[in-house]
Interface confidence: medium
């Protein structure tokens, strides 16, 4: 069957970060906004502690992706944007006694945007 | 004071596994604010990092190692391990361990502590 | 990955002189979110571990005279020594810490005339 259609961004974390319409089912399996929305409040206390500026963009790339009527796929951040926000949030996560994600993990994310591997750039 | 002091085997074949253990002592490896990791240097060579483990297992590995590396820690025997495979002649080297401090405050974030560092010979 | 590069890569200094070491970096050490530089300073002496001398671009490491300063921004990066000891003799490296794998250069030596 066909892609779903984009929607709109509704998760107030994920609003006003540059792109506006989403896809489900996103990066993780989530078939919703809300019940992604419920996971990523999870990561709210990291994000407001301004660990790394890319993190709340980064997490919304794979909770509520980009999506364009283009492109049949969601399309997550690359994989540079996900090393520098675990590099500089990781530590943080350590000192609460949380390890980083393996939901999150960097190296399922493309190297670089290129035609085949569609990813956003910081 | 915090004491790092590697231990395993010197001698180690062509193709097989090298393995490598460090012992903390003088605090607790569960510490907050620190990674702990493995650096190695070949002979009259430079320093090299090869990856790095939290309290928790989370990994950072380097890209040109990743493949055959594996690194673990043990925080009821307060130590962490390093597990190389499918050595060659090139990973002869001083094989160092480190802490790596983390000020979650300012950021600041160095190699602070190191163990006196062990040579490996791969050789057959 | 990041490319740091030494110059000179040995150095011979009369003791009571100024020495200076350059680290130069592929890419920016500074990380734009916090204002840190992401450059430290290691010393190894002759058959030990190395020790860390500065970090984040000038602080000085517990323990360090204040006779070692270290100082530059983005890419290009320096090591004073103002007045050198005997006991400052081995191999200095930079690293930086900015971005995985973190990486050294390939270290400066210093020896005593």
């Known amino acids: 069957r066909g892609a779903a259609p984009c929607q709109a961004v509704e998760i107030p974390m994920c609003r006003g970060i540059g792109y506006n319409l989403t896809r489900m089912p996103n990066l993780l399996g989530h078939t919703s906004q809300g019940e992604a929305a419920a996971e990523l409040a999870e990561f709210a206390p990291l994000v407001q502690y301004g660990c790394h500026s890319h993190l709340r963009f980064f997490l919304c790339s794979l909770y509520a992706p980009m999506c364009t009527d283009q492109v049949s796929t969601p399309i997550p951040a690359c994989r540079p944007m996900c090393e520098q926000a675990r590099l500089r949030c990781a530590p943080i996560m350590e000192q609460f006694n949380f390890g980083w994600p393996d939901s999150l993990d960097c190296a399922r994310l493309p190297t670089r945007n290129d035609p085949h591997a569609l990813c956003m750039e910081a | 004071q915090l004491q790092l002091q590697e231990s395993g085997s010197g001698l180690v074949k062509p193709s097989q596994t090298l393995s490598l253990t460090c012992a903390v002592s003088g605090g607790s490896i569960s510490s907050g604010g620190y990674s702990w990791s493995w650096i190695r240097q070949p002979p009259g060579k430079g320093l090299e990092w090869i990856g790095s483990i939290y309290h928790s297992g989370s990994t950072y590995y380097n890209p040109s190692l990743k493949s055959r590396l594996t690194i673990s820690v043990d925080t009821s025997k307060n130590q962490f391990s390093l597990k190389l495979s499918s050595v060659t002649a090139a990973d002869t080297a001083v094989y160092y361990c480190?802490?790596?401090?983390?000020?979650?405050?300012?950021?600041?974030?160095?190699?602070?502590?190191w163990g006196q560092g062990t040579l490996v010979t791969v050789s057959s | 990955d990041i490319v740091m590069t030494h110059t000179p890569l040995s150095l011979s200094v009369t003791p009571g002189e100024p020495a200076s070491i350059s680290c130069r970096s592929s890419r920016s050490l500074l990380d734009t979110d916090d204002g840190n530089t992401y450059l430290d300073w290691y010393l190894q002496k002759p058959g030990q571990s190395p020790q860390l001398l500065i970090h984040t671009l000038s602080h000085r490491a517990s323990g360090v005279p204040d006779r070692f300063s270290g100082s530059g921004s983005g890419t290009d990066f320096t090591l004073k020594i103002s007045r050198v000891e005997a006991e400052d003799v081995g191999v200095y490296y930079c690293?930086?810490?900015?971005?995985?794998?973190?990486?050294f250069g390939q270290g400066t030596k210093v020896e005593i005339k």
């Open positions: 480190a802490r790596f401090y983390y000020d979650i405050l300012t950021g600041y974030s160095y190699f602070d502590y």
């Open positions: 690293m930086q810490s900015i971005q995985l794998p973190w990486t």
